[in-house]
């Protein structure tokens, strides 16, 4: 199996097992109850059969209990994300027990060896949960296992081995290598808890996928398609994260799942919504912004429990940093005629004007091609809440921005030197907001002028019958 290039550490020659010394190495798992929001505090260590620490450290038997499970490590120390997550859980659920599962000695190994250790760590967690269940008032239903990377599969094993069913498992970019395509009992799967929700942020269809691509939960959420995360490009990393290397890009994208979850804990007033869709391409086309029949959900901690017959893949766009929430819009543009389009696809931009704010100029991504006498659907998203939309400016970019388009223009010119003006006719744009589920129709300001050509713009205002609101549920109403 391939060894990934450092999903939770730096890319260097640290993949060997630590050198053995005369000290006996205990291949054990520790449970650290984080008793304080202060990340420096040493916390309390819990062990099966020892009730005193539960009393000394005020373990709350009736409260929610979170187990945070780290993944593979190249450094042998806790990654910095862990303290953020602990703090966020304490902030959101003040009475909850937050337990860090420390399996560093077993994770600080060759990746393949760490993978082989996940089962034994899962067993240790299950034993701890079985022991806690013997206590009065402790309920497995209140247990929420949160596993990052390899830790997500550890959570799966724990959920599989425990006597009973844990309430919830959240998989934060579950590890891909050695788990992709594996049997359900050898990876995180929906039967490991009453509710299994998963965030996928580093999946790749080419090369090595650090995160698992396949759906493994009741709901599997793929922010930004589950691959390229905004703010994690090499340029972004050079400027902000420790140092700009490919490894840091990997780390940034893989770890983004943790930050999206933290965001859902600390910014509950700015929830991000994901929409069910069969694949990323269809989502990019703007086809999947429905909230009917549980087709949308909050992401992260606020996700509503959905136990579907089959895995539900959900998608959303995000900002580059916290708060990650964006506002999604489906734009349906009916092109009823066009002239002399040639080989090249037009490059369109829209600017949305609302009661609260105006958007930036947003590109319309043409996933396939512009169809004539058909409704073309696009996805656009804004970082700010525009309020109610008032008008839309549609611009057809003039000069070609890519060498490829320039070449195609040149070829078109050679074959058709007189090249009469390219033109496209659009009468109306239908807009649906993902977040409010409201639908609006916008008509050209001048009903006589419906044509647009390169370098020109067309303005649309709400049609007279404009404020059509379908009987669909708004996700904002459904927050827990």
């Amino acid at each position: 199996s391939p060894v990934p290039f450092g999903p939770e550490g730096r890319l260097e020659d640290k993949l060997h097992k630590p050198k053995a010394t005369q000290t006996e190495v205990k291949p054990s798992v520790r449970f650290n109850l984080r008793t304080s929001k202060d990340p420096e505090h040493e916390g309390c260590y819990l062990s099966v059969g020892h009730s005193q620490p539960l009393e000394d450290c005020s373990f709350n038997m009736t409260a929610k209990t979170f187990f945070i499970i780290h993944g593979w490590t190249m450094s042998g120390i806790f990654e910095n994300w862990l303290h953020k997550l602990v703090s966020a859980l304490h902030t959101r659920e003040k009475d909850a027990n937050v337990v860090v599962v420390d399996w560093l000695p077993l994770a600080h190994q060759l990746y393949t060896d760490a993978v082989n250790n996940t089962r034994v760590v899962g067993h240790s967690i299950a034993r701890m949960l079985d022991w806690l269940q013997e206590k009065d008032d402790f309920s497995l239903g209140n247990v929420h296992l949160i596993g990052y990377s390899l830790g997500a599969h550890v959570a799966g094993y724990a959920g599989n081995f425990v006597k009973g069913t844990v309430g919830r498992i959240t998989g934060l970019d579950p590890a891909g290598p050695m788990f992709e395509g594996a049997d359900i009992h050898k990876r995180l799967s929906p039967d490991d808890a009453d509710f299994v929700d998963v965030l996928h942020t580093y999946t790749r269809s080419f090369g090595l996928s650090i995160g698992i691509q396949m759906p493994v939960g009741h709901i599997d959420i793929y922010p930004n398609g589950g691959d390229f995360q905004p703010g994690c490009g090499l340029n972004d990393v050079l400027g902000s994260i420790a140092y700009g290397t490919i490894t840091e890009v990997v780390k940034c994208e893989h770890e983004r799942a943790v930050h999206l979850f933290v965001d859902s804990l600390v910014n509950q007033d700015k929830p991000s919504f994901a929409f069910q869709c069969t694949d990323s391409n269809r989502f990019k086309k703007g086809i999947c912004l429905s909230c009917r029949k549980n087709r949308c959900n909050s992401i992260g901690y606020n996700a509503k429990k959905m136990r579907n017959k089959r895995n539900s893949k959900m998608y959303l766009k995000t900002r580059a940093g916290m708060p990650f929430r964006v506002y999604h819009y489906q734009m349906k543009i009916h092109v009823f005629s066009y002239k002399n389009m040639g080989e090249i696809e037009p490059t369109f931009y829209v600017t949305l004007y609302g009661t609260n704010a105006d958007s930036q100029t947003l590109p319309l991504e043409i996933v396939e091609r512009i169809e004539q006498n058909a409704t073309n659907t696009f996805l656009v998203y804004t970082e700010e809440d525009l309020g109610d939309l008032l008008k839309i400016q549609l611009t057809w970019e003039g000069a070609s921005q890519s060498w490829y388009n320039l070449w195609k223009e040149f070829r078109s010119y050679l074959s058709q030197p007189r090249n009469p003006g390219r033109e496209l006719n659009i009468r109306r744009i239908r807009v649906k907001s993902g977040e409010t589920q409201r639908k609006l129709t916008f008509c050209t300001e001048d009903p006589e002028n419906t044509s647009i050509s390169p370098g020109r713009e067309l303005w649309f205002r709400k049609c007279r019958d404009g404020w059509r609101m379908k009987n669909e549920t708004s996700p904002t109403v459904e927050l827990p």
Partner: antibody, heavy 120, light 111 residues
Framework: QVQLVQSGAEVKKPGASVKVSCKAS????????MNWVRQAPGQGLEWMGW????????TYAGDFKGRFTFTLDTSTSTAYMELSSLRSEDTAVYYC?????????????WGKGTTVTVSS | DIQLTQSPSSLSASVGDRVTITCKAS??????????MHWYQQKPGKAPKLLIY???NLASGVPSRFSGSGSGTDFTLTISSLQPEDFATYYC?????????FGGGTKVEIK
């Protein structure tokens, strides 16, 4: 109170070995990692590595792989740093310092240091 | 590894002076809103002592004339009114990643 007590100064010949001890008291030994820091005469501080006091797994910094060995005796809450095949450039003060497993991992408690002199 | 460059390497000051020492990291030592930068004081023949942790937090028992500031790659240690016992060498340290590294030190001497 929390303290780290290190063994006394050592004078060794080149090629010999030395074992420096660091005994912890006033806290739960296994709840903090133990680090080793070297300071050559008139020079700055150099991190040598650390040992996980619970698992016994040592980690060595790049320049300290090979001749250096970190070990533990958890029954006496003592960490050891052994250096073999001594050279004159190993002459330095060696400090042990604890750091938490959680949070920002600064070195909040230091031993007084053990001076190792390598001279023929 | 992250390099830390301290300046000045030495300075002469009088009791009561305001002293500022800077530490520049070769890359950011911030993680989210936390800075993994710390300051230590070392007197001749003694072990280093933690002064400031996480850029601006005063360690237990450290006088309030010491303060730290900064984020990203640029950090400052300030002694608002230098006292006789403050003549020592000061080191910055980053712990955002292993190996933790120290700056070269700034020696504060009596003018």
């Amino acid at each position: 109170q929390v303290q780290l007590v290190q063994s006394g100064a050592e004078v060794k010949k080149p090629g010999a070995s030395v074992k420096v001890s660091c005994k912890a008291s006033g806290y739960t030994f296994t709840n903090y990692g133990m680090n080793w820091v070297r300071q050559a005469p008139g020079q700055g501080l150099e991190w040598m590595g650390w040992i996980n006091t619970y698992s016994g797994v040592p980690t060595y910094a790049g320049d300290f792989k090979g001749r250096f060995t970190f070990t533990l005796d958890t029954s006496t809450s003592t960490a050891y740093m052994e250096l073999s095949s001594l050279r004159s450039e190993d002459t330095a003060v060696y400090y042990c310092a604890r750091r938490g497993y959680y949070g920002r991992r600064y070195f909040d408690v230091w031993g007084k240091g053990t001076t190792v002199t390598v001279s023929s | 590894d992250i390099q830390l460059t301290q300046s000045p390497s030495s300075l002469s000051a009088s009791v009561g002076d305001r002293v500022t020492i800077t530490c520049k990291a070769s890359q950011s030592v911030d993680y989210d809103v936390d800075s993994y930068m710390h300051w230590y004081q070392q007197k001749p023949g003694k072990a280093p002592k933690l002064l400031i942790y996480a850029a601006s937090n005063l360690a237990s028992g450290v006088p309030s004339r010491f303060s730290g500031s900064g984020s990203g790659t640029d950090f400052t240690l300030t002694i608002s009114s230098l006292q006789p016992e403050d003549f020592a060498t000061y080191y910055c340290q980053q712990t955002i990643e292993d190996p933790p590294t120290f700056g070269g030190g700034t020696k504060v001497e009596i003018k």
